[in-house]
Interface confidence: low
């Protein structure tokens, strides 16, 4: 888990190694001032807009050779034992919103699997990041007031949650995950949800200040 | 290479209807949204339409709201636009872009363009 | 609707030297949502400039984009002969707006 000194560093994404180099840069020229930190993520931020692919693709060849470097360290990790794969999740806790790129997914993927039957989850993925990166901001806008009804609702429902108290996992004694039939199925699932998530947060890089200006 | 190619245009008279399309070839046509930009003669460009990737979504100028009617096919990576109501102000070559995200959300890829012109 | 405003219509200017055109949005346009498009007679558009200020690929460095505000700038810093066209600035914030244009001419 978190505590465990020997699992491998995770790994980075282009992003993140554009904001480290910034971050070294900084300390070059100013060795001694402070940092302010949510001013420096915006410059990053409008740094790494402006850039041009040639330029990104220098970051962008770092997080693939540290993902090859996560993915092999991965593979020599022994977890501590007691550590399971799933952390426990309260069955009972409000469901994490999902994002307007998310909805945009669930609404395009069926047509997708549909119009190209043999594509690959990671194919279908990479279409959908594609789609939603070609679409106007006006046309986003259904999918981005959806998401953020569902984000309000969530935040009440996640307070009123907290507000009762979490139930004691222990207790529960649900913290190994089911070995069903339905295994497979949720971890299909799960590939899907992680190939969005991935498109989803190239995409908050790319996309976090539109909503200021549109 | 990326190449779109428009047809359909030609002498309409006022009130009178046309169909443009845009043949796409060299890319992923189903990946991109697509539009028709015109330009009347000595004029500048005016945006005219937008169709998203699968084209579940469109949107028009004011200027052709109503009487214009942006479609894809993409089994056909063709792009259409018909024209309805046209009057002299649609006179103008029409041309056809790919919105090419990849160059920072821009269109970089246009047609040659097709002279529609509607006079009596 | 955003507007896009042009300035000058036309621009009269030698080769080799500097030219400088306006283009100011009506309302606030991020600055990744900006596009300058040269065109000469019977030719189709072509994208110089994205994001404001980022070149197109086979753009030659003389030619630059900067913002300040609602104001963008498109600055050529030494005219060539086949610079003479029209220009044109385009925002994509809220679908697609194209400014008026403006003619550079040689003098």
């Known amino acids: 888990g978190k505590g465990d000194p020997k699992k491998p560093r995770g790994k980075m994404s282009s992003y993140a190694f554009f904001v480290q180099t910034c971050r070294e840069e900084h300390k070059k020229k100013h060795p001694d001032a402070s940092v302010n930190f949510s001013e420096f993520s915006k410059k990053c931020s409008e740094r790494w807009k402006t850039m041009s692919a040639k330029e990104k693709g220098k970051f962008e060849d770092m997080a693939k050779a540290d993902k090859a470097r996560y993915e092999r360290e991965m593979k020599t990790y022994i977890p501590p034992k007691g550590e399971t794969k799933k952390k426990f999740k309260d069955p009972n806790a409000p469901k994490r919103p999902p994002s307007a790129f998310f909805l945009f997914c669930s609404e395009y993927r069926p047509k997708i699997k549909g119009e190209h039957p043999g594509l690959s989850i990671g194919d279908v993925a990479k279409k959908l990041g594609e789609m939603w990166n070609n679409t106007a901001a006006d046309d986003k806008q259904p999918y981005e007031k959806k998401a953020a009804k569902l984000k309000e609702k969530y935040e009440k429902d996640i307070a009123a949650y907290r507000a009762k108290g979490k139930p004691d996992a222990a207790k529960k004694g649900v913290v190994k995950a089911e070995k069903s039939k339905k295994k497979k199925e949720e971890e299909e699932d799960e590939e899907d949800e992680e190939d969005e998530e991935e498109e989803e947060d190239e995409e908050d890089e790319e996309e976090e200040e539109d909503d200021d200006d549109e | 290479e990326v190449q779109l190619l428009e047809s359909g245009g030609g002498l309409v008279q006022p009130g009178g209807s046309l169909r443009l399309s845009c043949a796409a070839s060299?890319?992923?046509?189903?990946?991109?949204?697509m539009l028709w930009v015109r330009q009347a003669p000595g004029k500048g460009l005016e945006w005219v339409s937008y169709i998203s990737p699968s084209g579940g979504f469109t949107n028009y100028a004011d200027s052709v709201k109503g009487r214009f009617t942006i479609s894809r096919d993409n089994s056909k990576n063709t792009l259409y636009l018909q024209m309805n109501s046209l009057r002299a102000e649609d006179t103008a070559v029409y041309y056809c872009?790919?919105?090419?995200?990849?160059?920072?959300?821009?269109?970089?890829?246009w047609g040659q363009g097709t002279l529609v012109t509607v006079s009596s | 609707d955003i507007q896009m405003t042009q300035s000058p219509d036309t621009l009269s200017l030698s080769p080799g030297e500097r030219a400088t055109l306006s283009c100011r949005a009506s309302?606030?346009?991020?600055?990744?949502?900006l596009a300058w498009y040269q065109q000469k007679p019977g030719q189709a558009p072509r994208l110089l400039i994205y994001?404001?200020?980022t070149r197109a690929t086979g753009i030659p460095d003389r030619f630059s984009g900067s913002v300040s505000g609602t104001e963008f700038t498109l600055t050529i810093s030494s005219l060539q002969p086949d610079d003479f066209a029209t220009y044109y600035c385009?925002?994509?914030?809220?679908?697609?707006?194209f400014g008026q244009g403006t003619k550079l001419e040689i003098k």
């Open positions: 385009q925002q994509y914030n809220s679908y697609f707006t």
């Open positions: 060299g890319f992923t046509f189903s990946w991109y949204s």
């Open positions: 309302q606030s346009v991020n600055s990744r949502n």
């Open positions: 994001g404001a200020s």
């Open positions: 872009a790919r919105w090419d995200y990849n160059s920072g959300w821009y269109y970089d890829h």
